[in-house]
Interface confidence: medium
């Protein structure tokens, strides 16, 4: 994040940016930036594998939920969207695309349907779903 | 928006930021930045006037919907929140805090209740509500 004050002095801007303001990113063009993470919601319904491929093609991954505090904007997300959580049948655990295990108490997992993939729904819920069902999806890019 | 390439060369960073990536803002700390506008969702329920005062104290205004394209993140917002739209009884029009008139086809106005203020709901809907009813609210700051 570039200090607004530094950028101001650098470019000798007339407009005074308050010290409490800052830039967010960098993110792909027209993505949402929040607490230095980048998010994009894709309207087109794809299965989990196609959704993953779409995110990867944009140098991102499917949504990873790692912090209720840093990702509290997710509380307000309407509807259901693929996230990067998958079931590992060998050990029965749920893990993210990057191989990390789902931390306890982050998501309420609702395992009523058969499936090895998960939909994100508002208020930090994860609905287990068949990976081949088309759904909208959320891509995420964590800034360095 | 500061060109990622320019900032890269300026600070001689090792990490190469793609040309398509950019910074967003500036915004108040921990606000959502999208297409160079800043948004914050406030959980605390206040009436419309208190909500407006809260936004103003943060150098922002209540949400103004001006473009479905530039504000398409609002499609997926869960629940109902005060926005800066008010009814002008003298001429029967709806206008924003800055005095501009609500553009046609931007919001579907649903007059469920008697009132002169409006709640924003997902998919660009505006619900008419009594201004003194407490609700959560969205503040917005347009970057220069």
């Amino acid at each position: 994040i570039w200090s607004a004050v530094f950028l101001n002095s650098l470019f000798n801007q007339e407009v005074q940016i308050p010290l409490t303001e800052s830039y967010c990113g960098p993110c792909p063009k027209n993505w949402i930036c929040y607490k230095n993470n980048c998010y994009q919601f894709f309207n087109e319904s794809k299965n989990w594998y196609e959704s993953q491929a779409s995110c990867m093609s944009q140098n991102a991954s499917l949504l990873k939920v790692y912090s209720k505090e840093d990702q509290d904007l997710l509380k307000l997300v309407k509807s259901y969207h693929w996230m990067g959580l998958v079931h590992i049948p060998t050990n029965g655990s749920w893990q993210w695309e990057d191989g990390s295990i789902l931390s306890p108490n982050l998501l309420t997992i609702i395992e009523m349907q058969k499936g090895d993939c998960a939909l994100y729904a508002s208020s930090f819920k994860g609905y287990i779903e068949n990976c081949s069902i088309p759904n909208t999806y959320i891509c995420m890019q964590r800034t360095v | 928006i500061w060109s990622a390439v320019f900032l890269n060369s300026l600070f001689n960073q090792e990490v190469q930021i793609p040309l398509t990536e950019s910074y967003c803002g500036p915004c108040p700390k921990n606000w959502i930045c999208y297409k160079n506008n800043c948004y914050q969702f406030f959980n605390e329920s206040k009436n419309w006037y208190e909500s407006q005062a809260s936004c103003m104290s943060q150098n922002a205004s209540l949400l103004k919907v001006y473009s479905k394209e530039d504000q398409d993140l609002l499609k997926l917002v869960k629940s109902y929140h005060w926005m800066g739209l008010v009814h002008i009884p003298t001429n029967g029009s709806w206008q924003w805090e800055d005095g501009s008139i609500l553009s046609p086809n931007l919001l579907t106005i649903i007059e469920m209740q008697k009132g002169d203020c409006a709640l924003y709901a997902s998919s660009f809907k505006g619900y008419i509500e009594n201004c003194s009813i407490p609700n959560t609210y969205i503040c917005m700051q347009r970057t220069v």
């Epitope: 309407k78 509807s79 395992e111 009523m112 349907q113 058969k114 499936g115 939909l119 287990i128 068949n130 | -």
Partner: antibody, heavy 118, light 110 residues
């Protein structure tokens, strides 16, 4: 197309048992959670129980807990409701309904009437 | 006594608009999706609205749902005689670990 057909209803005395069945067709039954919902004559809908796709998770309404058991046989595409210690207040039309993650009860059967009377 | 509260009946003239309310708590409506079902006389219920305000395919756009906090409402515009039915709101309840319905509202088209 999706079809759910309930059977097994009838007249039964208080304290006795009855088993309802719901035959499913037109979709992959083994992939979906299923519910039972009932409706007493002239009254509203009351949720009874739900079972996950593989039968590992079951939830019941307080009014039937300990008396009713929901189960399924995926090889037969059939959902069951075993009702023991029946009471007059269990008199109702019993519906089975398919659960979908996003739409909840998207398909319903036509119902089977259970009358508990001496 | 239902966990979700609905008015027992509403009535309105043809071509008018009617709204049916549904009141709950943070453990059901406040934190979970609200669905609405229509039950025509002598028929099984039919899904009318899901996830607060979404319409399943085949349902007329005269029906609309909304939710605010722990309350939800169903609006029907351009009322027709075939809309005469019982309408139920419903949601999962995190405290009860079960699905809860409203008591139902009988709509009469005058």
């Amino acid at each position: 197309q999706v079809q759910l057909v309930e059977s097994g209803g009838g007249v039964v005395q208080p304290g006795r048992s009855l088993r309802l069945s719901c035959a499913a067709s037109g979709f992959t039954f083994s992939s979906y959670a299923m519910h039972w919902v009932r409706q007493a004559p002239g009254k509203g809908l009351e949720w009874v129980a739900v079972i996950s796709y593989d039968g590992s998770n079951k939830y019941y309404a307080d009014s039937v807990k300990g008396r009713f058991t929901i189960s399924r046989d995926n090889s037969k595409n059939t959902l069951y409701l075993q009702m023991n210690s029946l009471r007059a207040e269990d008199t109702a039309v019993y519906y089975c309904a398919r659960y979908d993650n996003t739409r909840i009860f998207d398909y319903w059967g036509q119902g089977t009437l259970v009358t508990v009377s001496s | 006594q239902s966990v979700l509260t609905q008015p027992p009946s509403v009535s309105e003239a043809p071509r008018q608009r009617v709204t049916i309310s549904c009141s709950g708590s943070s453990s059901n409506i406040g934190n979970n999706a609200v669905n609405w079902y229509q039950q025509l006389p002598g028929k099984a219920p039919k899904l009318l609205i899901y996830y607060d305000d979404l319409l399943p395919s085949g349902v007329s756009d005269r029906f609309s749902g909304s939710k605010s906090g722990t309350s939800a409402s169903l609006a029907i515009s351009g009322l027709q005689s075939e809309d005469e039915a019982d309408y139920y709101c419903a949601a999962w309840d995190d405290s009860l670990n079960g699905y809860v319905f409203g008591g139902g509202t009988k709509l009469t088209v005058l």
